[in-house]
């Protein structure tokens, strides 16, 4: 399956935090999307092979790594001045 | 910042099997990306030999697989290249060679490289 | 085997000149992802080669601004704007879209 954690995370102001994605499902594909709320999914960034990543439409404040197929964090950044949402990881084939 | 280094005989007698061995810095081979072999006969162009990947994995160059074995020594964050049967021909510098972050498979960090003479 | 074809293999050129180096892959380099991982590398004499750019036209830390690259498919070009003294040396293209991983034969910049 796939694994997300931590399920809830506080920030302090002018912090970097991460938040883990594993999937042991051997896809290649996987994605970090942000819910706002009353808002749809918004695609922030996703990475279809190991060590290539492209940035999706929010990207701005974000950072991600893709170092083996099973993982795929996203590191909020002190950037990012409004990070409170839900965020989702997702993987495909 | 990723550092390799190549180490092992310069001098092989063909039909012997040569082996190097890559010692990586600053990064963990088991922390992910892939390790890779390349290497440059005298005056001649790059060939890419294969690699390991982070989870022990191999790919390997059509062309030299039936010779070519790369494995690793987690312990000592190193992986090593052997070749078989060598012949004149196998007369190169040999790299070990690694991807930089978000860049695929393309490789940027290099050892200096080590030349290996194959000679009787 | 995907064959990368550069063009020329050598080339005289001054400093100041815009020098344009081809590459020709023998199958198309776009991946399953969409992404296109053709790459070029400098290389001096005993020196490990240096990465220049990745995925075309993406130009790698540090790499000064008068090299780009561009192209699609299997047709591609390096481009140098303005040579300067350090750009002597040894260009190749290399592709990482189908194993096994290939380079070019090589391009040689020589001064005029």
């Known amino acids: 399956g796939i694994t997300q954690s931590p399920k809830y995370l506080f920030r302090k102001e002018g912090q970097n935090v991460t938040l883990s994605c594993e999937q042991n499902l051997n896809h290649d594909a996987m994605y970090w999307y942000r819910q706002d709320p009353g808002q749809g999914l918004r695609l922030i960034y996703y990475s279809q092979i190991v060590n290539d990543f492209q940035k999706g439409d929010i990207a701005e404040g974000y950072s991600v790594s893709r170092e083996k197929k099973e993982s795929f964090p996203l590191t909020v950044t002190s950037a990012q001045k409004n990070p409170t949402a839900f965020y989702l990881c997702a993987s495909s084939i | 910042q990723v550092q390799l280094q190549e180490s092992g005989p310069g001098l092989v007698k063909p039909s012997e099997t040569l082996s190097l061995t890559c010692t990586v810095s600053g990064y963990s081979i088991t922390s992910g990306y892939f390790w890779n072999w390349i290497r440059q006969p005298p005056g001649k162009g790059l060939e890419w030999i294969g690699y390991i990947s982070y989870d022990g994995s191999n790919n390997y160059n059509p062309s030299l697989k039936s010779r070519v074995t790369i494995s690793r020594d987690t312990s000592k964050n190193q992986f090593s290249l052997k070749l078989s049967s060598v012949t004149a021909a196998d007369t190169a510098v040999y790299y070990c060679?690694?991807?930089?972050?978000?860049?695929?498979?393309?490789?940027?960090?290099w050892g200096q490289g080590t030349l290996v003479t194959v000679s009787s | 085997d995907i064959q990368m074809t550069q063009s020329p293999s050598s080339l005289s050129a001054s400093v100041g000149d815009r020098v344009t180096i081809t590459c020709r892959s023998s199958q198309s380099l776009v991946h399953s992802s969409g992404n296109t991982y053709l790459h070029w590398y400098q290389q001096k004499p005993g020196k490990a080669p240096k990465f220049l750019i990745y995925?075309?036209?993406n130009r790698f830390s540090g790499v000064p601004s008068r090299f780009s690259g561009s192209g699609s498919g299997t047709d591609f070009t390096l481009t140098i704007s303005s040579l300067q003294p350090e750009d002597f040396a040894t260009y190749y293209c290399?592709?990482?879209?189908?194993?096994?991983?290939?380079f070019g034969q090589g391009t040689k910049l020589e001064i005029k």
């Open positions: 060679a690694s991807p930089s972050p978000g860049t695929g498979y393309a490789v940027d960090y």
């Open positions: 290399s592709q990482s879209t189908h194993v096994p991983f290939t």
């Open positions: 995925k075309v036209s």
